[in-house]
Interface confidence: low
């Protein structure tokens, strides 16, 4: 921003203080710095006599030798004394420039804050997409490959990276499967992506009684209630954020099943034999 000229010392050069002002268009005059300044204190001593003019009709300035110009070499020996109330010390545009500059700065910082302020990344567990089942008759073991669907929404005005997805499946408070996906995708500003991930699960050992249930032909839909847990790790500007979801889902362990998204939450558990 510009400096206020009224704050400059009396011995500032005209280049520093008031560019391009000559005695010709000055309403006041070039003065000997011996004159009393406004607060009544003496200024510095100078070799030049006091001269006064009042404008275009004033007497020719003796120090300018009638030329209306300061002789070469004297630029640094003369000072201009201007009343504090002189309008030229308060150019009308300075306030405007200052306010405009402040406004632009505020606007830019506001925009920066608005666009760069971290917003939430929403993770919505949609449900089980498919469940593929196989059995080991000898070991009385069930193998279930469960594919789940997630919707991840980026509410930011910049891209975020889905760094990894960790998932686990629980049955009857026992973890029966885990999965981890790395470097999955980048989600653009204000964009949403649907991500499928598969968790291989094994129901065996102390839960081998489930083998009977899952292979029981008297039941058409062998639904078991599984707890799906998923944690999504996203990064932006080097900052990491984790979002977790938990949901109970029905999965049919008696056959390969493809679900309408969200359907596995509301399936009938037991159906009579026709």
């Amino acid at each position: 921003m510009g400096k206020s000229l009224s704050h400059l010392p009396l011995h500032s050069s005209k280049e520093d203080a008031y560019d391009g002002v000559t005695s010709e268009n000055m309403r006041n005059g070039l003065v000997n710095s011996e004159v009393h300044n406004e607060d009544g204190r003496n200024g510095d001593v100078s070799q030049f006599p006091y001269v006064e003019f009042t404008g275009r009709d004033s007497v020719t300035c003796p120090t300018c030798q009638g030329t209306g110009r300061i002789p070469r070499g004297q630029e640094n020996q003369l000072v201009a004394l201007i009343p504090y109330s002189d309008q030229r010390l308060r150019p009308r545009r300075t306030k405007l420039y200052v306010m405009a500059s402040v406004f632009v700065c505020l606007l830019l910082s506001g925009l920066a804050v608005f666009f760069l302020f971290p917003r939430s990344i929403d993770v919505k567990y949609i449900g089980v997409k498919s469940a593929y089942v196989s059995y080991d008759v000898q070991k009385r073991t069930i193998y279930l490959n469960i594919t789940n669907t997630l919707n991840i929404t980026n509410n930011n005005y910049y891209s975020v990276e889905v760094e990894n997805i960790t998932a686990q499946v629980q049955f009857s408070k026992t973890v029966i499967g885990k999965a981890r996906l790395n470097n999955i995708t980048i989600i653009g500003p204000l964009d949403m992506k649907q991500i499928d991930y598969t968790v291989p699960t094994v129901i065996a050992e102390e839960m081998s009684y489930m083998y009977d249930f899952c292979t029981l032909i008297s039941i058409k839909v062998h639904n078991i209630v599984l707890m799906m847990q998923v944690t999504v790790t996203t990064t932006y500007f080097g900052h990491s954020e984790q979002i977790s979801q938990e949901r109970y889902q029905y999965v049919d362990c008696g056959r390969n099943t493809t679900y309408q998204l969200g359907q596995s939450e509301y399936l009938n558990v037991l159906q009579p034999q026709q």
Partner: antibody
């Protein structure tokens, strides 16, 4: 300790319905199926149907469809069976029992005697 | 519906004897998927609810004494009680665990001579 506590004996006139209860304790109610079984005097056990407290799903023996209505109240871990259009044929001991992902009930209630008499 | 037929309808035994009772089903109770037979045996004493003894045709429920043995496959099943005790006097039911509706046999009543 696993318990299925059934409501006390009832003596009713033919016609109006009767509702008997089975309060579960000692296990997670919503993890199990609740079955209802009828034991008539001089007859064998008859399976009425089952209800799954997790979501209220039911499955009935065709013979008892329209006769019995099975419901649950998960907040109180209680299963209910309502018998309607009562006749003397409905006089029996009614049992509730639980199963966990199998069809063989392992715990049974003490039974509720329903006597239909004019 | 699967019809369960039990025989005999009653048995008179002395304490310490070995007893065998039979249960036949109108359809096979064998699950070809896992090669298990879905048949259960229950014991019911007067004034008490039924008690699960055997499931899967031959698996003893926890807490059931090993003198109770289940056997058989397909449509023919047997419950054997070796060394009968006084507390074993009850009605024994077999149950189709294979298909809905679940069905029970008429029962075999075990009595003391």
């Amino acid at each position: 300790e696993v318990q299925l506590q059934q409501s006390g004996p009832v003596l009713v006139k033919p016609g109006p319905p009767v509702k008997i209860s089975c309060k579960a304790s000692g296990f997670t109610f919503t993890d199990y199926y609740i079955h209802w079984v009828k034991l008539s005097h001089g007859k064998s056990l008859e399976w009425i149907g089952l209800v799954y407290p997790y979501n209220g799903d039911t499955d009935y023996n065709q013979k008892f469809k329209g006769k019995a209505t099975l419901t649950v109240d998960t907040s109180s871990s209680t299963a209910y069976m309502e018998l309607n259009s009562l006749t003397s044929e409905d006089s029996a001991v009614y049992y509730c029992a639980r199963t966990y992902y199998a069809n063989s009930p392992d715990y049974w209630g003490q039974g509720t005697t329903v006597t239909v008499s004019s | 519906d699967i019809v369960m037929t039990q025989s005999p309808s009653s048995l008179s035994v002395s304490a310490g004897e070995k007893v065998t009772m039979s249960c036949k089903s109108s359809q096979s109770l064998l699950n070809s998927g896992n090669q298990r037979n879905y048949l259960a045996w229950y014991q019911q004493k007067p004034g008490q609810p039924p008690k699960l003894l055997i499931y899967g045709a031959s698996t003893r429920e926890s807490g059931v004494p090993d003198r109770f043995t289940g056997s058989g496959s397909g449509t023919d099943f047997t419950l054997t009680i070796s060394n009968v005790q006084a507390e074993d006097l009850a009605v024994y039911y077999c149950q189709n665990d294979h298909s809905y509706p679940l069905t029970f046999g008429a029962g075999t009543k075990l009595e003391l001579k």
